[in-house]
């Protein structure tokens, strides 16, 4: 398990509506408490189930939200982000950024909808078993001769 | 821990009026929502009335009869239930949800009757008309 470790990185705007959970997920990060190292910006936390994010399915925990409403997350402040989301109003359209895992290691998350989310052994085990199934059958054909 | 108290139900007459109360304790948020629901015998439990700091909303069974209200200096939800029928009779419940949000904002919103949203209830109120 000690090869390289590739990720697929995709981004997706979901639209989510507030309910009487909220928009059912909190975050961390800003440039006072990095979550990431090197990485200020503001990540999903944890979602909750049966709210508004659950809910809408697109949206994971590790899940980095670029922008809020058009408005950009970068360099901020968390209680500055806090505000963004406050003043985002009943409706709120989020960029965020999926990160997969395709190698080496647990599978990461990935976005519902996003095709080329397919960690590579999930490829890799239908063709090795149809590989061996067709030998055997080769072999058998070629015994009956 | 959170905590919601229902009182005020009773048996009344068709036409009739009664006030029930939902005293709320354990929120660290402001913004809590706190709905009403009710459940007649044999009967799924039904969404009757929600209110937040920014929207109300009610089934259209009781609109224009039920008006509901929140003093949050007392952390307590009313429910103002007018022109009492006898479909009205069941045990009504008081809920409110977790907040998960960025901001600690939560509304109703337009799916509020859905019984998945709500974290907490009460143990119910029983109202009688009759």
């Known amino acids: 398990m000690n090869g390289r470790v590739d990720y697929l990185v995709t981004e997706e705007e979901i639209n989510l509506t507030r309910g009487p959970s909220g928009l059912g997920f909190n975050i961390v990060g800003g440039t006072d408490q990095q979550y990431v190292s090197n990485d200020s910006g503001i990540y999903v936390s944890r979602i909750k189930e049966n709210g508004a994010a659950a809910l809408d399915g697109r949206l994971q925990e590790g899940d980095k939200i670029l922008s809020v409403n058009g408005q950009d997350l970068k360099n901020l402040l968390h209680q500055d982000a806090v505000d963004l989301f406050r003043n985002a109003g009943y409706a709120v359209s989020l960029r965020v950024q999926h990160r997969l895992q395709v190698q080496n290691g647990p599978i990461g998350h990935r976005g519902e909808g996003d095709p080329s989310g397919i960690p590579i052994f999930m490829v890799l085990v239908p063709v090795f078993a149809l590989t061996m199934v067709a030998a055997w059958a080769f072999m058998r054909y070629r015994q009956q001769l | 821990d959170v905590q919601l108290v229902e009182s005020g139900g009773g048996l009344v007459q068709p036409g009739g009026s009664l006030r029930l109360s939902c005293a709320a304790s354990?929120?660290?948020?402001?913004?809590?929502?706190i709905s009403w629901f009710r459940q007649a015998p044999g009967k799924e439990r039904e969404g009757v009335s929600c209110?937040?700091?920014?929207?109300?909303y009610y089934a259209d069974s009781v609109k224009g009869r039920f008006t509901i209200s929140r003093d949050n200096a007392k952390n307590t939800v009313y429910l103002q239930m007018n022109s009492l029928k006898p479909e009205d009779t069941a045990v009504y419940y008081c809920?409110?949800?977790?907040?998960?949000?960025?901001?600690?904002?939560?509304?109703?919103?337009?799916?509020?009757?859905?019984?998945?949203?709500?974290?907490?209830w009460g143990q119910g109120t029983q109202v009688t008309v009759s």
């Open positions: 354990g929120f660290t948020s402001d913004y809590y929502v």
């Open positions: 209110i937040s700091s920014s929207d109300t």
């Open positions: 809920a409110t949800a977790a907040i998960w949000d960025p901001s600690g904002l939560a509304v109703c919103g337009s799916s509020w009757y859905r019984r998945g949203w709500w974290d907490y």
